[in-house]
């Protein structure tokens, strides 16, 4: 499966986005840093199948979108950046849904990486309970925008990586 | 690999201005702060201040606020430390270093190999 | 501003030795410490992070514990190689301050 050409585009408008959400300046906020985690493992070279991966970049990308769709989300971050932040994430997971399907069929492929995906969503649930703990501070949503693109990045290492594959 | 390369050193008369500059190449420049880090002759280490190259915020700690000068050009990986107005007593060793920021990853995990200003009359 | 304190502030032991240096912040920095050597003419090098982390290639010999003030950094078996200059450097909040500085000599 070929991802478009604005699937990458849209990768870099979201990573943008992202930078311009920031809300205060980081250099407060050290103390706050947390260990979310990220589940690394699933975002190495490991020998898995394409298929795979992308089932894991669209499960992270759908996490994403949750996470920052939330009521919470919207109080603490810019309206306008918020929505268009939702535009770029849905068109990335429209672009994956059809990949997944194009790789190994509708039916299997939720069931069939399991684990990796679980991984995925357990690790954004660290990320919802640290931000709950901290009453969704502005230092903590500063960290965890911080740790969103970090993130990012490594879903946007792993697609051109399955890119080069090709 | 991840370098951190600073520009050389430098012999400066009192009152002269200067410009040092730190080079990060190996890694994504504008994910991670630059700090600088003095060391005087025969001394310890003082953090004078940090740049987030994205978008060039800065944070200098009280002793080197209004003495010193960082900034970042992002487009060709670089940060600088500058003077306006060198003393004696700016005499040191100085290095770069990088920090993840509010990532969670060690603190200034590399460093550039130092630059020596020397300021005497 | 966050005061670390290092003790002592050089030590001599001999190859093979156990050694121990401590850190104590003004107030409390949870685990947000760093400990750095650094050798003559040298940048320093980061060697444990978050207190008890351990940096990428950095030998096992090397421990950090500790939270809250009061920190270690642990040298089991002291190597030739060891014999320099130990930082802490308390990464909790700016300005960050670093100790003053503890030299390992040859005893």
């Known amino acids: 499966c070929d991802l478009p050409q604005t699937h990458s585009l849209g990768n870099r408008r979201a990573l943008i986005l992202l930078a311009q959400m920031r809300r205060i300046s980081p250099f407060s906020c050290l103390k706050d840093r947390h260990d979310f985690e990220f589940p690394q493992e699933e975002f190495d070279d490991k020998q898995f199948q394409k298929a795979q991966a992308i089932s894991v970049l669209h499960e992270m990308i759908q996490q994403t979108f949750n996470l920052f769709s939330t009521k919470d989300s919207s109080a603490a971050l810019d309206e306008t950046l918020l929505d268009e932040f939702y535009i770029e994430l849905d068109q990335q997971l429209n672009d994956l849904e059809s990949c997944v399907m194009q790789e190994v069929g509708v039916i299997e492929s939720p069931l069939m990486y399991e684990d990796s995906i679980l991984a995925v969503r357990k690790y954004f649930q660290r990320i919802t309970l640290y931000l709950t703990e901290k009453k969704y501070s502005s230092c903590a949503w500063e960290v965890v925008r911080a740790e969103i693109m970090r993130s990012f990045s490594l879903s946007i290492n792993l697609q051109k990586r399955l890119k080069s594959k090709e | 690999e991840v370098q951190l390369v600073q520009s050389g050193a430098e012999v400066k008369k009192p009152g002269e201005s200067l410009k040092i500059s730190c080079k990060g190449s190996g890694y994504s420049f504008t994910s991670y702060w630059i700090g600088w880090v003095r060391q005087m002759p025969g001394k310890g280490l003082e953090w004078m201040g940090i740049i987030d190259p994205s978008d060039s915020d800065t944070a200098y700690s009280p002793s080197f606020q209004g003495q010193v000068t960082i900034s970042a050009d992002k487009s060709i990986s670089t940060a600088y430390l500058q003077w306006s107005s060198l003393k004696a007593s700016d005499t040191a060793m100085y290095y770069c270093?990088?920090?993840?920021?509010?990532?969670?990853?060690?603190?200034?995990?590399?460093w550039g190999q130092g630059t020596l200003v020397t300021v005497s009359s | 501003d966050i005061q670390m304190t290092q003790s002592p502030s050089s030590l001599s032991a001999s190859v093979g030795d156990r050694v121990t240096i401590t850190c104590r912040a003004s107030?409390?920095?949870?685990?947000?410490l760093n400990w750095y050597q650094q050798k003559p003419g040298k940048a320093p090098k980061l060697l444990i992070y978050f207190a008890s982390s351990l940096q990428s290639g950095v030998p096992s010999r090397f421990s950090g514990s500790g939270s809250g003030t009061d920190f270690t950094l642990t040298i089991s078996s002291l190597q030739p190689e060891d014999f320099a200059t130990y930082y802490c450097?308390?990464?909790?909040?700016?300005?960050?301050?670093f100790g003053q500085g503890t030299k390992v000599e040859i005893k």
């Open positions: 270093a990088r920090h993840p920021g509010l990532n969670w990853a060690p603190d200034f995990d590399y």
């Open positions: 450097q308390q990464a909790h909040s700016f300005p960050l301050t």
């Open positions: 107030q409390s920095i949870d685990e947000f």
